[in-house]
């Protein structure tokens, strides 16, 4: 009797189990009772990540420049093309077919995380003692100037912008 | 015990015709792939024609094709090989095989076909 | 079609020898191929299937090896009854083809 399901590696052609084509290789044709599936290399610039019976290979992603786009791992006959953006630039997706610029973290913020290729820049408030006073995309919440270990005193408060200032104690006349 | 019995070789002049049967024993015939292989005297072996279980799918080898036609007769557990316009290069003993999962198995003893004026 | 080469042609050995075949094929046939062995006035034998696989009954001698484009059948200690005519056969594209043979004679 004809099979009616193959196995994983296998597929169904004229009531016969054929053999899939193992990644980086197309189908050229399909097995019968005398041959078994014959499959080629995919070519230059081409690449099947799967077991398939595809007649055509993918073409590898082009990472295009004037997108900010270089490439981060040349593609194989079994991989695709990974590509990433240029330094301060990062994908607008998980597939990186364009980039944009890193987000900076405006005065009253810091950088939580800093960006990457394929992810932008994380900002987060500074809390109470912490101050930003820039709009950057790599410096942090910095911490209130200490006027005590200075033995000065805060003459002016600070806020999430803007660090205390520290002035000289009072002296009793 | 699986066997397979070669008939109908002979003389025959160029341009003539023959018809070989391969009496098949032993196995469920028709779950099984057949084919014909030939031999020329002092020659290696050449796969000439194969055909499936169910008669759907026939293939056969360049030198032979438009000449030669495979068929079977499953409820007469027959496979056979109608050869026309023969020419002397198609001298040679004939086989019959059993394929399974891509390997012939099992071999008749073979039949001999001259071509000859 | 695809091309299948064996070689030697012919070989002499000793019975007890290790004996070793080759066969290439003009382009890659993973691990499709097929060894048989033929006697004089006998029809052909299959002794080894799928490049490696030895067939049910056929002595431990015998063994297979290869992928891609290029195989060998070994015979790791002759006995007289293996002097004969080995010859591959690709099944990796239509249509099957075999090798020219190699003729195993006695020294």
């Known amino acids: 009797e004809p099979p009616t399901a193959c196995s994983d590696k296998q597929y169904l052609h004229d009531g016969q189990c054929c053999s899939l084509c193992q990644p980086g290789q197309k189908l050229v044709s399909d097995c019968t009772e005398f041959t078994e599936t014959e499959c080629l290399p995919c070519g230059e610039s081409e690449f099947l990540d799967t077991w398939n019976r595809e007649t055509h290979c993918h073409q590898h992603k082009y990472c295009d420049p004037n997108l900010g786009l270089r490439v981060q791992q040349k593609g194989t006959s079994e991989t695709d093309t990974i590509c990433t953006c240029e330094e301060g630039w990062h994908c607008t997706s998980e597939a990186c077919e364009s980039c944009v610029l890193h987000r900076s973290c405006s005065p009253g913020f810091g950088v939580k995380q800093i960006a990457t290729g394929v992810s932008d820049t994380i900002c987060e408030p500074c809390p109470v003692g912490f101050f930003s006073n820039v709009s950057s995309a790599f410096e942090k919440c910095h911490p209130w100037t200490s006027c005590e270990t200075k033995d000065l005193v805060v003459q002016q408060a600070g806020t999430n912008k803007t660090d205390v200032v520290c002035g000289p104690q009072d002296r009793l006349r | 015990e699986v066997q397979l019995l070669e008939s109908g070789g002979g003389l025959v002049q160029p341009g003539g015709s023959l018809r070989l049967s391969c009496a098949a024993s032993?196995?469920?015939?028709?779950?099984?792939?057949m084919s014909w292989v030939r031999q020329a005297p002092g020659k290696g072996l050449e796969w000439v024609s194969g055909?499936?279980?169910?008669?759907?799918?026939?293939s056969y080898a360049d030198s032979v094709k438009g000449r030669f036609t495979i068929s079977r007769d499953n409820s007469k557990n027959t496979l056979y090989l109608q050869m026309n316009s023969l020419r002397a290069e198609d001298t040679a003993v004939y086989y019959c095989?059993?394929?399974?999962?891509?390997?012939?198995?099992?071999w008749g003893q073979g039949t001999l076909v001259t071509v000859s004026s | 079609d695809i091309q299948m080469t064996q070689s030697p042609s012919s070989l002499s050995a000793s019975v007890g020898d290790h004996v070793t075949i080759t066969c290439r094929a003009s382009?890659?046939?993973?691990?499709?191929l097929n060894w048989y062995q033929q006697k004089p006035g006998k029809a052909p034998k299959l002794l080894i299937y799928?490049?490696?696989s030895l067939q049910s009954g056929v002595p431990s001698r015998f063994s297979g090896s290869g992928s891609g484009t290029d195989f060998t059948l070994t015979i790791s200690s002759l006995q007289p009854e293996d002097f004969a005519t080995y010859y591959c056969?690709?099944?990796?594209?239509?249509?099957?083809?075999f090798g020219q043979g190699t003729k195993l004679e006695i020294k």
């Open positions: 095989a059993r394929y399974y999962s891509y390997h012939m198995d099992y």
């Open positions: 032993g196995f469920t015939f028709s779950s099984y792939a």
């Open positions: 055909i499936g279980g169910s008669s759907s799918y026939t």
């Open positions: 382009q890659s046939i993973s691990s499709y």
């Open positions: 799928a490049a490696s």
């Open positions: 056969q690709q099944y990796g594209s239509a249509p099957p083809t």
